[in-house]
């Protein structure tokens, strides 16, 4: 049967791909086959043959970026160290060994699901602009985060969350396969505004909040506050 | 894609003989290495392999077939044969070809739909 796993690793950071025999296995490398390919595509991470040595067949995503120990797999340790974690490595990678002794059963059969997550920069709300007399409009931005975001804008008087229809959000992807968004929320114009842009990002359970506030005898300023959700309500009491 | 297609399942007495083929539908490049076996499957009990045989001649044999069954390939014509003798009720099951690509990687496989192998007393 196949083990399942899953493991969150940050863009730019190494990770470990877990998969391994339980602990005084021992393997004669003349005798294992052991691939590391994703689950759909199909595609080569890296791979032991016996009298084999070259690794021309790795795809060239994976190529000098995805090791496996020699000394490890001895032991049954088949894991796999990926290097500069990417967007594009978020799937589902197979770990695959077989014993050529024993007919080529594999012996070993691991399915690693790797998530990927960067911190969005904090976001950047700009002066409220007024395109009518009753409008005002704000535009907050962030950039360079994992997965897609949620966008939340928040009325800072209550804490309550205003309501989506007002606001108008676009995603993109960006050069590095990072996601940057800008929201740009419409209000109707009132004497005091006090609000805040809020982006979520839920696999790091990590809010950035920005508030900006506007008034007849008080400029706008800014406020920042990075909070860690503990609970999975989604922004539940996490904006000051 | 390659296709398995397998012949020769059928209902037999114990102690009788059948003789299982199974044909590739293309073959692996003649620098690959594949291993071509026969699996089965009885109800409520997962899939084991019978016996194998690999490109490169290497065979195997479950310990419960050792010395009844013999496996062969004729790589020109990407066939496998299951010759099996002296058939007890326990080989009752469905039998599965199987084509396994060791090299080039990635590792693929490729199953047969499966005959029925029935041994009664």
């Known amino acids: 049967d196949t083990q399942e796993k899953e493991v969150r690793a940050m863009v730019g950071s190494d990770v470990e791909l877990s998969c391994a025999c339980p602990e005084g296995s021992r393997f004669d490398l003349n005798d294992v086959y052991v691939y590391w390919q994703t689950s759909e595509s199909k595609t080569v991470v890296t791979y032991h043959i016996p009298q084999n040595s070259s690794l021309e067949n790795v795809d060239s995503r994976y190529r000098n970026r995805a090791l496996m120990s020699p000394a490890g797999m001895l032991r049954g340790d088949f894991s796999l160290r990926l290097f500069n974690v990417t967007p594009q490595d978020e799937q589902k990678f197979h770990c695959l060994v077989l014993s050529q002794s024993l007919g080529f059963q594999e012996v070993l059969s691991v399915e690693v699901t790797l998530h990927v997550a960067a911190n969005f920069s904090v976001p950047v709300v700009s002066a409220p602009h007024s395109p009518s007399q009753d409008e005002l409009t704000f535009t907050c931005t962030s950039i360079n985060g994992y997965p897609r975001p949620n966008v939340y804008w928040i009325n800072k008087t209550d804490n309550s969350l205003l309501d989506q229809a007002l606001q108008n959000d676009t995603v993109f992807l960006n050069m590095r396969g990072l996601y940057d968004v800008v929201s740009v929320l419409r209000i109707a114009r009132t004497p005091s505004v006090n609000i805040g842009c809020c982006i979520e990002n839920v696999l790091l359970q990590q809010n950035l909040t920005v508030g900006s506030q506007t008034g007849n005898d008080i400029g706008e300023r800014d406020k920042i506050t990075e909070n860690p959700v503990s609970t999975g309500e989604k922004n539940a009491a996490t904006w000051s | 894609e390659v296709q398995l297609v397998e012949s020769g399942g059928g209902l037999v007495q114990t102690g009788g003989s059948l003789r299982l083929s199974c044909a590739a539908s293309?073959?692996?490049?003649?620098?690959?290495?594949?291993?071509m076996g026969w699996y089965r499957q009885s109800p409520g009990k997962q899939r084991e392999l019978v016996a194998s045989i690999s490109s490169f001649g290497s065979t195997y044999y479950a310990d419960s077939v050792k010395g009844r069954f013999i496996i062969s390939r004729d790589n020109a014509k990407n066939t496998v044969n299951l010759q099996m003798n002296n058939l007890k009720l326990e080989d009752t099951a469905v039998h599965f070809c199987?084509?396994?690509?060791?090299?080039?990687?990635?590792?693929?496989?490729?199953w047969g739909q499966g005959t029925q192998v029935t041994v009664s007393s």
């Open positions: 293309s073959s692996t490049s003649t620098s690959s290495i594949d291993v």
């Open positions: 199987n084509l396994r690509r060791l090299s080039p990687p990635p590792l693929l496989d490729y």
